[in-house]
């Protein structure tokens, strides 16, 4: 267990031209606050994915009113650190999102309005217990300077807050193989080798080889859920380590509390402890207001402060949903024509066109035949973004450069023999067949299935195919 700490040093215009307008004005004074979201690992997750390591919201900063004509200075900041407690091991690598929010304090009849001024994100490696790390991030024309660190909560120590320290048993030294706990030299590191198979979610150990259960779990490896009712066995009430199973379903089985509420049993039924923004017997009623900062991705919250009031988020381009939580898949509308590849860059759509097409949506068919010649009297045919040659008789290939062998496709039927000829091919038919491709049988009595054979040709003579 431990705490991630974030210290904001300044938020203001970044260097270079194009200084941003002050977010506050005499007509609309405002104040800033910050939100930090932490996720384990180096994943580049979407902004709306859960802050699995935790999140924190700062206090509101001092009210600021722009001086007319003055450039936006560094804006007054809230006091104190943003602290994100973590219960398990510190992962060492993490992703962060830091959002700077503006709270407008004008004559908002329905209560104040919140809008996202800037969001920065990054991926970092950080060992717990180390010094403060300094960072500068830019979001558009704004610049955010901050420091952060992760520290372990006693008795945890180490770069991941997984080692425990215990007071020394002997005054002079630690036990065999155990080191002093820096910086607590009067304490010794406790080897944390729990019993094999001890549940990593529901069990822990303070002594090697043991498996102690978190509240609500029991069994030698802390894998069996327990009821919080009193046990009727001789052992008396359940404890986190010994626990006992109570047969029959409990009122909290299946967790009747919606929206992340936690269930606890009462003598008659159950009770839901609802997260912020929800209420009702089962946390089924959303009481979210703009004060809860529900809008993602730079959405502007519109709504009253009254819990009964509706709220909604006015979304920036590329996002939709009540909370602007959904990225619009603008490529699903297939805006790129003629087989172009669609790329959603967030701020804009791009189409990568296939050869032969151009334009913002690949809508222009280029002249495929421009500058392309077909040899040996072939003619160029456009289509599908690629040119094709229709070749003159006796030629083939992509550009009609290859002399075609008319007999290659074995065009003479029924065993007829094929001869190449300057004007095409000639089939010498086997006995009993006739026709340009020897396709017609000759009747036994010598009569043909065709009308009379052309003058000068007897059945069985070679038939020339023109």
């Amino acid at each position: 267990a431990g705490v991630f700490e974030l210290q904001i040093h300044s938020f203001g215009p970044g260097p270079g031209p194009g200084a941003p307008r002050s977010p506050c004005s005499a007509r609309l004074p405002c104040r800033l606050f910050f939100r930090v979201c932490l996720k384990p690992g180096l994943s580049e997750e979407a902004a709306e994915s859960p802050c699995a390591l935790g999140a924190a919201l700062s206090a509101r900063g001092p009210v600021y009113t722009e001086q007319p004509g003055a450039p936006a200075p560094d804006l007054p900041l809230p006091d104190g650190l943003l602290q994100v407690p973590f219960r398990d091991a510190w992962p060492g690598t993490f992703s962060f999102i830091i959002e700077t929010w503006r709270e407008e304090l004008g004559d908002q009849i329905g209560g104040p309005a919140w809008s996202l001024l800037a969001r920065v994100a990054g991926r970092r490696r950080l060992a717990a217990g180390g010094p403060w790390a300094r960072d500068i991030q830019r979001a558009g024309a704004w610049e955010l300077r901050f420091s952060y660190r992760a520290r372990c909560e006693p008795p945890a120590v180490g770069t991941a807050c997984t080692r425990l320290c215990r007071p020394r048993s002997a005054p002079s030294r630690c036990g065999p193989g155990l080191r002093p706990c820096a910086p607590l030299e009067d304490e010794c590191e406790a080897p944390l080798v729990c019993r094999a198979g001890c549940s990593p979610e529901h069990g822990f150990c303070e002594q090697p080889g043991e498996c102690r259960c978190l509240e609500g779990w029991t069994g030698p490896l802390c894998t069996v859920p327990v009821s919080t009712s009193s046990c009727l066995s001789p052992r008396g009430p359940s404890s986190a380590t010994t626990g006992c199973l109570v047969p029959g379903p409990g009122p909290c089985d299946g967790n009747p509390c919606a929206n992340g509420g936690s269930c606890s049993e009462t003598p008659r039924s159950f009770e839901c402890t609802c997260p912020r923004g929800f209420y009702g017997l089962r946390c089924e009623v959303s009481g979210v207001t703009c004060a809860d900062g529900p809008c993602f991705n730079g959405g502007l919250c519109v709504g009253g402060a009254d819990p009964d009031s509706a709220y909604i988020c006015h979304c920036p381009p590329g996002f939709q949903g009540s909370n602007c939580e959904k990225r619009v898949d603008r490529c699903s509308l297939q805006p790129c024509r003629n087989g172009g590849l669609c790329l959603d860059l967030g701020h804009a759509l791009r189409c990568r066109c296939r050869a032969g097409f151009a334009g913002p949506r690949c809508e222009h068919d280029l002249d495929d035949c421009a500058g392309r010649a077909c040899a040996n009297g072939g003619t160029c045919v456009e289509g599908g973004g690629a040119h094709r040659c229709s070749c003159a008789l006796g030629f083939g290939g992509r550009d009609c450069r290859e002399r075609a062998d008319p007999c290659a496709a074995r065009p003479c039927a029924h065993g007829g023999r094929c001869y190449a000829h300057f004007s095409g091919l000639v089939c010498a038919c086997a006995p009993g067949y006739m026709g340009a491709r020897c396709e017609f049988p000759v009747h036994p009595d010598g009569a043909s299935a065709l009308p009379a054979a052309p003058p000068g040709l007897r059945p069985g003579d070679p038939q020339r195919y023109l």
Partner: nanobody, 115 residues
């Protein structure tokens, strides 16, 4: 100064229906988030129904299932259909529009629901 124009308010019996309209001539409502606030005497304004610029809708708990907000982009108008009206729905209803740059209000239209 852009103002929104509300219409459709009036006196109605409990259980009855009304349809409020909100129009604008100087601004386009289709790319705005538009809502209906109401203010009963001695109480603060409450946003009862709202439709966002991406056409998501939301309602105050007290009107869910009874009120419906919709828009007609061709007429540049947003509507609030109010059914099963109750005496506690009596209030002045204000049309409100907002984008990232500015916000706009109407003058309000009175809705009175008799028991």
């Amino acid at each position: 100064q852009v103002t929104l124009r509300e219409s459709g308010g009036g006196l109605v019996q409990a259980g009855g229906s009304l349809r409020l309209s909100c129009g604008a001539s100087e601004i386009t409502l289709s790319d705005k988030t538009v809502g209906w606030y109401r203010q009963a005497p001695g109480k603060q304004r409450v946003l009862v129904a709202v439709i966002s610029n991406v056409d998501s809708t939301n309602y105050a708990h007290s009107v869910k299932g009874r009120f419906t907000i919709s828009r007609d982009n061709a007429k540049n108008t947003v509507y609030l259909q109010m059914n099963s009206l109750k005496p506690e729905d009596t209030a002045v209803y204000y049309c409100y529009a907002r984008d990232f740059e500015a916000e706009y209000w109407g003058q309000g239209t009175l809705v009175t629901v008799k028991p």
